[in-house]
Interface confidence: low
């Protein structure tokens, strides 16, 4: 004959454990039902009655099968630099992630605790490493033969245009100015934009080094993060 299925509450056989979605109540010394996600234990089991479960109240949740007396409080509302990517429901906590143009400076188990605006590279500096969901932009000085004339968290250093006759030589923050005769080659007529960080865990690849018309001496320059432009700590 098949073994008789025990209904909760029941006393487990010595040395055995309770089944899936059951827990052992020390007071009753019985195997009792857990409450499903979105519920909590309103009344604990006794030797003769099973656990009584009740739905979580507004702004509280339980994510797992449980026997907690109170549901967990959902996290505080998302701040202005965040977007709510998962709402607070009876079965899941609110998750806040950083809005575009910001990165997570201090993460928590799920979502982000503290967002910070992506650094903007000032003129003369370009993006060496783009920002990600969890890391800030890294700026670097533009190498000889390249420039950036923008304050941006996405623009890399671009090569100077090559002139037949140079009117004004380019520098790190300004393109070369040619005389009225057209340049032989315009390497990069528009700003090169790196993608904004997206809300995924994938890492952006390092931008490829920009071409330079002069031998690179960037190893002589400080390559650490540059300070952003004055007043550029965020929108």
């Amino acid at each position: 004959l098949p073994a008789q299925v025990a209904f909760t509450p029941y006393a487990p056989e010595p040395g055995s454990t309770c089944r899936l979605r059951e827990y052992y109540d020390q007071t009753a010394q019985m195997c009792c039902s857990k409450c499903s996600p979105g519920q909590h234990a309103k009344v604990f089991c006794t030797k003769t009655s099973d656990t009584v479960c009740d739905s979580c109240e507004d702004s509280t949740y339980t994510q797992l099968w449980n026997w907690v007396p109170e549901c967990l409080s959902c996290g505080s509302r998302c701040s202005s630099d965040q977007v709510e990517t998962q709402a607070c429901t009876r079965e899941q906590n609110r998750i806040c992630t950083c809005r575009p143009g910001w990165y997570c400076a201090l993460s928590k188990q799920e979502g982000c605790r503290l967002c910070a605006p992506l650094r903007k590279c000032r003129p003369g500096f370009g993006v060496a490493r783009p920002g990600t969901e969890t890391s800030d932009v890294v700026c670097k000085p533009c190498a000889p033969g390249t420039f950036s004339n923008t304050t941006s968290s996405t623009d890399i250093c671009r090569p100077h245009q090559i002139c037949n006759v140079v009117a004004i030589p380019g520098n790190a923050s300004m393109d070369a100015v040619c005389t009225s005769t057209s340049p032989t080659r315009s390497m990069a007529p528009g700003a090169v934009h790196l993608p904004q960080p997206v809300s995924t865990r994938s890492q952006h690849t390092q931008p490829t080094p920009e071409p330079s018309t002069a031998p690179s001496t960037s190893f002589l320059l400080p390559m650490g993060p540059s300070p952003p432009a004055e007043g550029s700590t965020g929108d």
């Epitope: 409080s73 996290g75 650094r119 650490g224 540059s226 952003p228």
Partner: antibody, heavy 119, light 106 residues
Amino acid sequence: EVQLQESGPVLVQPSQSLSITCTVSGFSLTSYSVHWVRQSPGKGLEWLGVIWSDGGTDYSAAFISRLSISKDNSKSQVFFKMNSLQADDTAIYYCARNDDGGDYAMDYWGQGTTVTVSS
Amino acid sequence: EIVLTQSPALMSASPGEKVTMTCSASSSVSYMYWYQQKPRSSPKPWIYLTSNLASGVPARFSGSGSGTSYSLTISSMEAEDAATYYCQQWSSNPLTFGAGTKLEIK
């Protein structure tokens, strides 16, 4: 009115543990986090750790092995426990409030409790 | 960890004088916070998010800066401004404070 009140003052023997309770009023621990900061005699401020509104904690790496912060939301109390105290842990210990969803400044501080480590 | 270096460590100013103290970070930070502390008192929030004055702070105070360089300025020193000022960052864990600038009245 927002208030934070640390228990104390305390005299602790070297190698013993320190326990401080921060009792708060005028706000809920389910909406605000609480930081712990200390100030050694004649010295500056040193951050020790924080317990967030959701119960998560972050500790300074220098103290992570001997510091524990917990709380009881219903009693509006935050509990600070540090083990293995030495003479250089003598300091004023402060709890301070921080808005999880705001500007992250510690906007209200307790009056501090003086902890002396001495045999 | 990000180390915050405040300078000068000690300064004195006459009433009406303009005062500037600086806070230099070992790595770039997003924002700086400033706290004022007087003897036998708890620190008080003074400036948050680099340039915003905390509630009750006189308008003669201002904060500015970006990257690794930040400053607190008093346009016209008053006797009640004598205190120690601490900068603080939390752009990366752990949260750190500067060693403080003690401002005295001449």
